[in-house]
Interface confidence: medium
């Protein structure tokens, strides 16, 4: 008898090369094989559970950056007046959550912020829990 | 044929709002659906393997905090004279281990330390390994 | 009917007690039960996917240390002029990758660097993806 295979784990890596003041970071998923999707510049959460979250990037100017998942809830990450980020976190997310950036720059500039090595990774840690597809 | 489902992953999120000097932090599990259990203010390990461990909190006064898993072994985390913690680690734990806090304050105060956003998450990384239920 | 079991997750913990200037760190796997293998002082990657990577150690002298996975690609970790490391990261690795150290010391010494608590852990986060055994 063939041993059971794992169904694919919900995970995604998105890249971002620019962010906009009072808006967010423009995210793109370089792979078509991701098991999670990007919609309206947000990562859509279909499965309840803990997620491992990795966030990296070097910014062209100082900014404050937050990563949100639900209106009215505190951010997953919040960094004030930084020019780079290299953080890992764990958070409980649920169906209907959407993971998205908010960015504020401290110059009066209208320009978008350029990002080197901008990468956000989400990996579901509780396969077997509730998912809505 | 229905594809095989994942059995639930061993994981738990506990919260703590206060810690006691020369003792530990009082942990509670807000969810009844956790796959791991709290007993005698410790998280009980039933499954061998690597665990992803996330520890967060803001303390009302400076303290030294350690997170232990086995008598006679070094701590999983050890923080000296801090007022906050936001750490992630990976450790190998095994059946019969118990994860618990030890706290020391540096004031002569007898009072409890209040904790804002106190959270400890453990997520098993090796399903398929040995478990004793 | 017996519920399906998880096949073992690809993971390994290697230890290193010394590193060599302009070379790497001598890694050994203390357990025979690891699901990943060490070959020519490198950890062999058989399965595509995200990996959780934990790197720890205290060094006997200041060094610059990088952890590589593929020729011509940037490092997984790069630390300049440090005497210790305690880092966690997430990276996408693929079949044929090999994870190995590169070390440079800043003394003129030819002697090995001694390492206390030197530990590198890799844990595959995408079971169900492609593996070549």
């Amino acid at each position: 008898q063939v041993p059971p295979q794992y169904p694919p784990i919900q995970s995604i890596r998105v890249q971002f090369t620019r962010c906009e003041n009072e808006k967010g970071c423009i995210i793109t998923s370089p792979s078509k094989d991701e098991t999670m999707k990007v919609q309206d510049n947000s990562i859509i959460i279909n499965c309840d559970g803990f997620y491992l979250i990795s966030l990296k990037g070097y910014f062209s100017e100082e900014l404050s950056l937050s990563l949100y998942y639900r209106k009215g809830r505190g951010p997953l990450f919040s960094l004030s007046k930084v020019t780079s980020v290299d953080s890992i976190g764990v958070a409980y997310l649920a169906f209907k959550d959407k993971v998205y950036f908010n960015v504020t720059t401290h110059s009066t500039s209208y320009k978008d912020i350029q990002v080197n090595g901008g990468e956000l990774i989400l990996i579901h840690q509780n396969p077997g829990g509730f998912c809505a597809y | 044929q229905v594809p095989p489902q994942y059995p639930p992953i061993q994981s738990i999120r506990v919260q703590f709002t206060r810690c006691e000097n020369e003792k530990g932090c009082i942990i509670t599990s807000p969810s009844k659906d956790e796959t791991m259990k709290v007993q005698d203010n410790s998280i009980i390990i039933n499954c061998d393997g690597f665990y992803l461990i996330s520890l967060k909190g803001y303390f009302s006064e400076e303290l030294s905090l350690s997170l232990y898993y086995r008598k006679g072994r070094g701590p999983l985390f050890s923080l000296s004279k801090v007022t906050s913690v936001d750490s992630i680690g990976v450790a190998y734990l095994a059946f019969k281990d118990k994860v618990y806090f030890n706290v020391t304050t540096h004031s002569t105060s007898y009072k409890d330390i209040q904790v804002n956003g106190g959270e400890l998450i453990l997520i098993h990384q090796n399903p398929g390994g040995f478990c004793a239920y | 009917q017996v519920p399906p079991q998880y096949p073992p997750i690809q993971s390994i913990r290697v230890q290193f007690t010394r590193c060599e200037n302009e070379k790497g760190c001598i890694i050994t796997s203390p357990s025979k039960d690891e699901t990943m293998k060490v070959q020519d002082n490198s950890i062999i990657i058989n399965c595509d996917g995200f990996y959780l990577i934990s790197l720890k150690g205290y060094f006997s002298e200041e060094l610059s240390l990088s952890l590589y996975y593929r020729k011509g690609r940037g490092p997984l970790f790069s630390l300049s002029k440090v005497t210790s490391v305690d880092s966690i990261g997430v990276a996408y690795l693929a079949f044929k990758d090999k994870v190995y150290f590169n070390v440079t010391t800043h003394s003129t010494s030819y002697k090995d660097i001694q390492v206390n608590g030197g530990e590198l852990i890799l844990i595959h986060q995408n079971p169900g993806g492609f593996c070549a055994y």
């Epitope: 906009e20 020019t83 780079s84 110059s107 009066t108 500039s109 209208y110 320009k111 080197n116 | - | -």
Partner: antibody, heavy 115, light 112 residues
Framework: EVQLVESGGDLVKPGGSLRLSCVAS????????MSWVRQAPEKGLQLVAG????????YYTDAVKGRFTISRDNAKNTVYLQMNSLRAEDTAIYYC????????WGQGTLVTVSS | HIVMTQTPLSLSVSPGEPASISCKAS???????????LYWFRQKPGQSPQRLIY???NRDPGVPDRFSGSGSGTDFTLRISRVEADDAGVYYC?????????FGQGTKLEIK
């Protein structure tokens, strides 16, 4: 293919007003900041004004502050430059450019301020 | 404001010959983490400007590999390895590290 088409340039008397428009196509307009750059006769290039993708943040060169207003309508893929209290020294070709690093330019529209 | 100074202001080159334009910034264009915001533009006679090079040395799509950018800190160079008749025009450098974006005064390239 990215295209930027400016319009609205004209001959106007000092103290007069003009509204320049730039219609964009070939890219997701609402995701990018936009700029206006001018070139006086036989002169170099000067950034005049810029606006972020949401329209919530703007930049003006000192010489036009309080007189010019940059705005955008993302539904119409259009960026505007409202120019009031025009002076002779505002005479130039006005170019619309994509982003603050000007990776694409329009063909320009000529503004002449003269009595 | 950062001042960008180009040299020479004009040059005349025969087809097939190399050409080089220098651009000097009044302060370093290097950001703390390594990006340098130096750009090159070309304006052909009667046309709008076109960006050729971004971040010192990266060619924009469609720009021939005859064009190359180099430099660091405050000193930068645009090189054309083999000039062609179509390369005639005014070349501008520009910096984007600090508001406002400022351009050099331009270098007029004439083909003999």
């Amino acid at each position: 293919e990215v295209q930027l088409v400016e319009s609205g340039g004209d001959l106007v008397k000092p103290g007069g007003s003009l509204r320049l428009s730039c219609v964009a196509s070939g890219f997701i307009f609402s995701s990018y900041s936009m700029s206006w750059v001018r070139q006086a006769p036989e002169k170099g290039l000067q950034l005049v004004a810029g606006i972020n993708s949401a329209g919530s943040s703007t930049y003006y060169t000192d010489a036009v502050k309080g007189r010019f207003t940059i705005s955008r309508d993302n539904a119409k893929n259009t960026v505007y430059l409202q120019m009031n209290s025009l002076r002779a020294e505002d005479t130039a070709i006005y170019y619309c450019a994509k982003r603050w690093v000007f990776d694409f330019w329009g063909q320009g529209t000529l503004v002449t301020v003269s009595s | 404001h950062i001042v960008m100074t180009q040299t020479p202001l004009s040059l005349s080159v025969s087809p097939g010959e190399p050409a080089s334009i220098s651009c000097k910034a009044s302060q370093s264009l290097l950001l703390s983490y390594g990006n340098t915001y130096l750009y090159w533009f070309r304006q052909k006679p009667g046309q709008s400007p076109q960006r050729l090079i971004y971040k010192v040395s990266n060619r924009d799509p469609g720009v021939p590999d005859r064009f190359s950018g180099s430099g660091s800190g405050t000193d930068f160079t645009l090189r054309i390895s083999r000039v062609e008749a179509d390369d005639a025009g005014v070349y501008y450098c520009g910096q984007g590290i600090q508001d406002p974006f400022t351009f050099g005064q331009g270098t007029k390239l004439e083909i003999k």
